[in-house]
């Protein structure tokens, strides 16, 4: 029989005490732990898992401290509850800051939000994977203990009349729940339905963490600075296991008897492609990562093809518009310092962004992999410093058009990072926001010339340049375009209004000019125009058909910087574009003419050669 250990977390420490040899506590040799909170383990792997409130991570390591890795590093606020599903090999956690209960595989893959509506500071979390239930406590306005199936369905309140409950623990053998109540300083127990409630201890100064093993409950007391144990039914036969321990956050017993049983997920992941989630009684459902949808086979998942991306200073988020109002998620992209602008290539499913702290354009897959710097911050050979401001992708030619604050030009760069050249440059020009319309061969940009801001249009090679608007503008900061509707949209951050026109500049109208404080990004998504307001920390939308008006999409999102809609790419339509096949045969810029044919063109420093395809 393997040895049983008490494991406990105490700020930068995770320590163990043998329950058999009564060893003194021994620190597990972990580096970089700052504020360990919730703890759990996977006995078959001999690994421990913990949340770190300060680092905002969930990590794991072997019991000897080796192979330490962060398994969840994004989108955590205060992950104060966490539990291992040892049968499905899933990780569950509750976050009192985001008010979400989430799940992923033990390595952090395939993350999904299970419960997010009407959650008020979810705290302690316990799993019963053999039965398919999860249990948690809430510390909000009305503290309670809730239960749901392990896929988040069938939610119910078990114990409504309770204080802020912590240390929620299941006695799997005797089918009882145990918890500490921080408001009454009681240790209580109930059956698995929250009934047959009993007080196990009522004379403790400050019980906090709690666990159960065999005939005993073990708890931490913040007042007595101790770990103690007592008989789990009578509360008698109390023993101090260890004293002089301040503020122990979580406690558990590491032993195989705490992780027994079987369910369908324990066998080949239930033949699910991503998550296998236990449900009552003894059943399972296949689950998908956030925003993915379960296919008709009920086993495999498909990635979203239509969604919204929005950026904050150091995060890029994805949002889907669906019936269940799925919550937005942070994409796991590292080293974002100051995201200024975002775009997306639906063909290669890659995200592009400008980081204005690092002064570069980067790209990555949505899962954070294949990170690559497309445009670097300086070109030493040319003694050139750049400051990318905005970008727009021509998906057909596979080019990025981007403006630069330092050089005040419009550049074109291939998606693989190779330079095409400068297409627009003028002594007085200050091009800033940009959006391309490759379907028609044009680009639109704001020109923030001193005292005379303009919105202009030019062909994608910088020719045919014309000013669309020069009056009624102060600081046009963002542009959006809908080729299907034939509309251009812009936001003016000084005038605090959003306007639109036809793509030729005709039919200019003010769409919205009330209660807009600092619009910084616009995008068109189906029949809606979405915008972000940095000052109000809000995403809003307006129905362009005029039927539904203005709607608040999401509030309290700090440091918003950009928003971009992604719609499903129709490959048939895509291939019909004359520039989609090998850039229309052009060496540099491929333009669609009014009759649907193409012409090749060149950046400013080159001229078109006699073959009318190449530049030299």
């Amino acid at each position: 029989v393997p040895e049983a250990f008490l494991l406990f977390s105490r700020r930068a420490d995770i320590r163990r005490i043998s329950l058999e040899t009564n060893n003194n506590n021994v620190a597990i040799p972990l580096t970089g732990v700052k504020e360990a909170s919730a703890l759990d383990f996977d006995v078959t792997d001999n690994r421990i898992y913990w949340t770190d409130i300060s680092l905002k991570t969930i990590s794991r390591a072997f019991m000897n401290g080796s192979a330490l890795e962060h398994v969840v590093e994004f989108g955590l606020d205060y992950p104060e509850g966490m539990a291992v599903d040892w049968l499905g090999k899933n990780l569950y956690w509750a976050d009192t800051g985001t008010n979400r209960i989430e799940v992923s595989k033990l390595d952090g893959q395939h993350r999904q939000v299970l419960v997010w509506k009407d959650l008020d500071s979810p705290r302690a979390l316990a799993l019963d994977p053999a039965e398919g239930f999860m249990y948690w406590t809430e510390w909000g306005g009305k503290p309670k203990i809730d239960r749901a199936a392990m896929d988040g369905s069938e939610r119910t309140t078990l114990v409504p009349n309770v204080g802020r409950a912590n240390g929620l623990t299941i006695d799997y053998a005797k089918r009882r729940l145990y918890w500490t109540d921080l408001d009454t300083n009681l240790i209580e127990s109930s059956n698995m339905l929250g009934l047959n409630r009993e007080v196990i201890a009522d004379d403790l100064p400050h019980p906090f963490g709690l666990t159960q093993y065999q005939d005993y409950i073990y708890w931490t007391d913040w007042s007595r600075r101790s770990i103690e144990r007592a008989n789990k039914t009578s509360g008698q036969n109390r023993t101090i296991i260890q004293g002089h321990l301040d503020y122990v956050m979580d406690i558990l017993v590491f032993h195989s008897s705490r992780q027994s049983g079987w369910n369908e997920c324990a066998s080949s992941n239930g033949h699910c492609s991503h998550l296998c989630l236990a449900v009552p009684v003894g059943g399972f459902v296949c689950g998908c990562p956030a925003h993915y949808s379960l296919n008709a086979d009920n086993r495999t998942c498909s990635a979203p093809t239509t969604f919204l991306l929005f950026s904050q200073k150091s995060a890029i988020n994805r949002m889907v518009i669906d019936e269940q109002q799925s919550p937005d998620i942070i994409l796991p992209i590292h080293s974002l310092r100051n995201v200024r602008a975002i775009d997306y290539d639906p063909l290669d499913k890659q995200l592009y962004w400008i980081d204005s702290r690092q002064n570069m354009i980067r790209k990555a897959q949505e899962d954070g992999s294949q990170g690559f710097t497309v445009v670097v911050s300086s070109v030493p050979s040319q003694n050139l410093e750049i400051q990318p401001y905005d970008l727009s992708i021509d998906i057909y030619s596979r080019y990025i058009y981007w403006t630069c604050e330092a050089t005040n030009v419009i550049n074109v760069t291939r998606l693989d990072g190779r330079s095409v050249g400068v297409v627009l440059k003028g002594e007085q020009d200050r091009p800033r926001a940009i959006v391309v319309n490759p379907e028609k061969g044009y680009m639109y940009f704001t020109n923030l010339q001193e005292r005379s801001p303009k919105i202009e249009r030019a062909a994608l090679d910088g020719t045919e340049r014309e000013v669309l608007f020069f009056s009624g503008l102060s600081k046009p900061i963002a542009l959006a375009l809908d080729s299907r509707l034939g509309k251009l949209f812009w936001a003016d951050s000084d005038l605090r209004r959003i306007e639109s026109s036809d793509l030729s500049g005709a039919n200019r109208i003010v769409l919205e000019d009330s209660n807009i404080l600092q619009p910084v990004g616009l995008t068109v998504f189906e029949n809606w125009l979405y915008w972000i307001d940095k000052q109000q920390q809000m995403i809003e939308k307006i129905d362009m058909t005029g039927r539904e008006g203005r709607t608040k999409v999401q509030a309290r999102i700090a440091q918003l910087s950009d928003i971009h809609a992604v719609k499903e790419l129709n490959l048939q339509e895509y291939r019909q574009h004359p520039c989609a096949q090998d850039n229309g045969g052009c060496s540099h810029i491929c333009l669609v003419k009014g009759d649907g044919t193409t012409r090749c063109s060149c950046p400013m420093h080159l001229v078109l050669l006699q073959d009318e395809l190449s530049c030299g």
């Epitope: 700020r11 930068a12 700052k34 909170s37 409130i53 300060s54 503020y247």
Partner: antibody
Framework: EVQLVESGGGLVQPGGSLRLSCAAS????????IHWVRQAPGKGLEWVAS????????DYADSVKGRFTISADTSKNTAYLQMNSLRAEDTAVYYC??????????????WGQGTLVTVSS | DIQMTQSPSSLSASVGDRVTITCRAS??????VAWYQQKPGKAPKLLIY???FLYSGVPSRFSGSGSGTDFTLTISSLQPEDFATYYC?????????FGQGTKVEIK
């Protein structure tokens, strides 16, 4: 028994220096943030600086940044506040306090008795 | 920096009275607020942490509530030893900041 004992206060001229000590006992020193908080005569509490001895992380109030330095000697379970370029407005009782971090959401659960620093010519 | 504004700055009350002191943060501080009691010539003592949790050994007549920007310290039945100055403090962001204090005096 948890104890925090400050020492090193006294009278010093403007522009002068002083080093305060905070000797900690009765708890695991490296598991706590150690703060210096001051209170000018008849006034409220003002946070000055903090250190997390385990990691060496430090923070300072803008009013003392560049003049004061907080440090800790984990072998002696002692935190220090080196105060240079002292000004009349630095006159206060200086308290040393500890915080267990997230456990109490940053609250300071034990305070020393304080040491008086008077900056005057 | 986050400002913590306490009110009132002073109040007079009698033994047995219910006393309420409020603290308003200049921006959202979640529940990262503590309350301290200080008597003349003494160091502050922690009463409430995380907005509403009673610190060990503190009498249950003290309670705290609130979240976001508005917080309250309540003494349900004022006792002679409760006459002191009370401070709120936020620890949501660095630097931690204190309210200016509320002096509770005998009427």
């Amino acid at each position: 028994e948890v104890q925090l004992v400050e020492s090193g206060g006294g009278l010093v001229q403007p522009g002068g220096s002083l080093r305060l000590s905070c000797a900690a006992s009765g708890f695991t020193f490296t598991n706590y943030d150690i703060h210096w908080v001051r209170q000018a005569p008849g006034k409220g509490l003002e946070w000055v600086a903090s250190i997390y001895p385990a990691g060496g992380d430090t923070d300072y109030a803008d009013s003392v940044k560049g003049r004061f330095t907080i440090s800790a000697d984990t072998s002696k379970n002692t935190a220090y506040l080196q105060m240079n370029s002292l000004r009349a407005e630095d006159t206060a009782v200086y308290y040393c306090a500890r915080s267990p971090g997230w456990a109490l959401r940053g609250a300071m659960d034990y305070w020393g008795q304080g040491t008086l620093v008077t900056v005057s010519s | 920096d986050i400002q913590m504004t306490q009110s009132p700055s002073s109040l007079s009350a009698s033994v047995g009275d219910r006393v309420t002191i409020t603290c308003r943060a200049s921006q959202d501080v979640s529940t990262a607020v503590a309350w301290y009691q200080q008597k003349p010539g003494k160091a502050p003592k922690l009463l409430i942490y995380s907005a509403s949790f009673l610190y060990s050994g503190v009498p249950s007549r003290f309670s705290g509530s609130g979240s976001g920007t508005d917080f309250t310290l309540t003494i349900s039945s004022l006792q002679p030893e409760d006459f002191a100055t009370y401070y709120c403090q936020q620890s949501y962001t660095t630097p931690p900041t204190f309210g200016q204090g509320t002096k509770v005096e005998i009427k």
